[in-house]
């Protein structure tokens, strides 16, 4: 008789999750030779230990501490790019501008990007059928707690000028409920971070509005200023040209506003 299994509202663990995490870890050490001695089996064991045999609505940041310790990585603190609701462009940017880093350019972010996982209380099984949805089921689920933990640590590590890419096509360009708005903004350290510079990415080709004047951007500016961090904002009117100019800054067309 099959054992009764909790049905959650979200999709189940990504298929071949253990193999995917291990393979990504090995690939990361190949791409980033400064991490060439990382023991990926130890990393996987710590990852697994954070959620296996635990109730998937009862996960804490403490559960992920062993993994956080193993994944400790020195990223240049003045080269951090945060993003909200515009992941693909942020990643395209750091692929070109190799000295800048998003969270997903770090080992732990790279391991978990776009994956889902959860276990079951009192069994060593991974649940491939369903996992808790943040809204419909619970917020303290393995995936949400992981991203909250790594995002907090990433923001805490930042210094000097921190950049954030925001999606100007959304109704809330800055969303207080996003990971950026709820975690990263509040964990930037005022004694280390001088300025948060927002890059608002325009979607429409003919969109010439100054989205830095958007009420949600003004709200972000207010939050940041209250934290004794300076705020600046730039419109990126042409993201395609923006990327092209990052690739070829000498191009004559790159002196005008992008």
């Amino acid at each position: 008789v099959p054992r009764w299994r909790q049905q959650w509202s979200g999709p189940g663990t990504t298929k071949r999750f253990p193999e995917t995490v291990l393979a990504r870890c090995v690939k990361y050490t190949e791409i980033h030779p400064e991490m060439r001695h990382v023991d990926c089996q130890s990393v996987w064991d710590a990852f697994k230990g954070a959620f296996i045999s635990k109730h998937p609505c009862n996960i804490t940041e403490e559960d992920y501490q062993p993994l956080m310790k193993l994944g400790t990585q020195t990223v240049p603190c003045n080269k951090i790019l945060l993003w909200s609701r515009i992941k693909d462009l942020a990643h395209q940017f750091t692929q070109v501008q190799r000295d800048m880093f998003t969270l997903e350019d770090t080992l732990l972010g790279y391991l978990a990007d776009d994956l889902t996982w959860c276990g079951e209380f009192n069994t060593s099984k991974i649940n491939y059928q369903s996992c808790p949805d943040w809204r419909k089921d619970c917020s303290n689920n393995p995936v949400s707690v992981f991203w909250k933990t790594v995002s907090r640590r990433f923001a805490e590590a930042a210094c000097d000028v921190v950049h954030v890419m925001l999606n100007g096509s959304r109704s809330k360009i800055f969303d207080k409920n996003s990971t950026f708005g709820s975690v990263e903004v509040h964990n930037l350290q005022p004694e280390k971070v001088q300025t948060l510079e927002a890059w608002v990415i325009h979607g429409g080709r003919e969109d010439s509005r100054d989205l830095c004047q958007d009420p949600t951007i003004k709200e972000l500016e207010s939050i940041i200023s209250k934290r004794n961090i300076q705020f600046s904002c730039k419109n990126i009117y042409r993201p395609d040209k923006f990327l092209q100019c990052v690739k070829n800054p000498e191009d004559s067309s790159c002196t005008s506003e992008i």
Epitope: H37, V38, D39, V43, P66, K69, L70, T72, T74
Partner: antibody
Framework: EVQLLESGGGFVQPGGSLRLSCAAS????????MNWVRQAPGKGLEWVGI????????YYADSVKGRFTISRDNSKNTLYLQMSSLRAEDTAIYYC???????????????WGQGTTVTV | QSVLTQPSSASGTPGQRVTISCSGG????????VYWYQQLPGTAPKLLIY???QRPSGVPDRFSGSKSGTSASLAISGLQSEDEADYYC???????????FGGGTKLTVL
């Protein structure tokens, strides 16, 4: 045959400078991360620092940071250790050692030179 | 004071099995692969074990390495007089961003 051969050791006054060389042969030097490791008389191994294949990345032990500089000339298959502001405690045998890469895996310090002695 | 802790000495009689321990922390041994080096008297160190438990070609299978959590160990079975040497463990430290060695263990074959 894979070989590393250090040279440039000798006697130097405290506060003085010295440049050690490590000539590599028998392998693709351009791709190899290269280490300097030292051993004071009667003591254990102490890692000094490392440089990546194209010379753009270096890491140093705290004890030598700001005083020692690791560089390389890939056209000459040679690794260097420029030592300045030398102290008595820098007296040691200095070894160069290769980090190898095989099948996308790295192997730390799989080949060592015979060492060169520095006396301060 | 080394970041990795090894016993300063170990001994055994020919044919015996001896184990040398190496203890560290979560940012070095636990996170990264452990390597072991053998230094015979008056010679340069030689790689003995890489990636926790792998042996380079030419190293006898009497030498074996293992790792568990923040500790690693080197086992030598069927001890021979030519095994008399100093043994060092080593690994990268992700927080210090440096390579760290243990203080070394002098193995005496009685």
């Amino acid at each position: 045959e894979v070989q590393l051969l250090e040279s440039g050791g000798g006697f130097v006054q405290p506060g003085g400078s010295l440049r050690l060389s490590c000539a590599a042969s028998g392998f693709n030097f351009n791709n190899a991360w290269m280490n300097w490791v030292r051993q004071a008389p009667g003591k254990g191994l102490e890692w000094v620092g490392i440089i990546n294949g194209d010379g753009t990345n270096t890491y140093y032990a705290d004890s030598v940071k700001g005083r020692f500089t690791i560089s390389r000339d890939n056209s000459k298959n040679t690794l260097y250790l420029q030592m300045s502001s030398l102290r008595a405690e820098d007296t040691a045998i200095y070894y160069c050692a290769r980090d190898n890469k095989l099948n996308d895996y790295y192997y730390a310090m799989d080949v060592w030179g015979q060492g060169t002695t520095v006396t301060v | 004071q080394s970041v990795l802790t090894q016993p300063s000495s170990a001994s055994g009689t020919p044919g015996q099995r001896v184990t040398i321990s190496c203890s560290g922390g979560s940012s070095n041994i636990h996170a990264n692969y452990v390597y072991w080096y053998q230094q015979l008297p008056g010679t340069a160190p030689k790689l003995l074990i890489y990636r926790n438990s792998q042996r380079p070609s030419g190293v006898p299978d009497r030498f074996s390495g293992s790792k568990s959590g923040t500790s690693a160990s080197l086992a030598i079975s069927g001890l021979q007089s030519e095994d008399e040497a100093d043994y060092y463990c080593g690994t990268w430290d992700n927080i210090l961003n440096v390579w760290v060695f243990g203080g070394g263990t002098k193995l005496t074959v009685l």
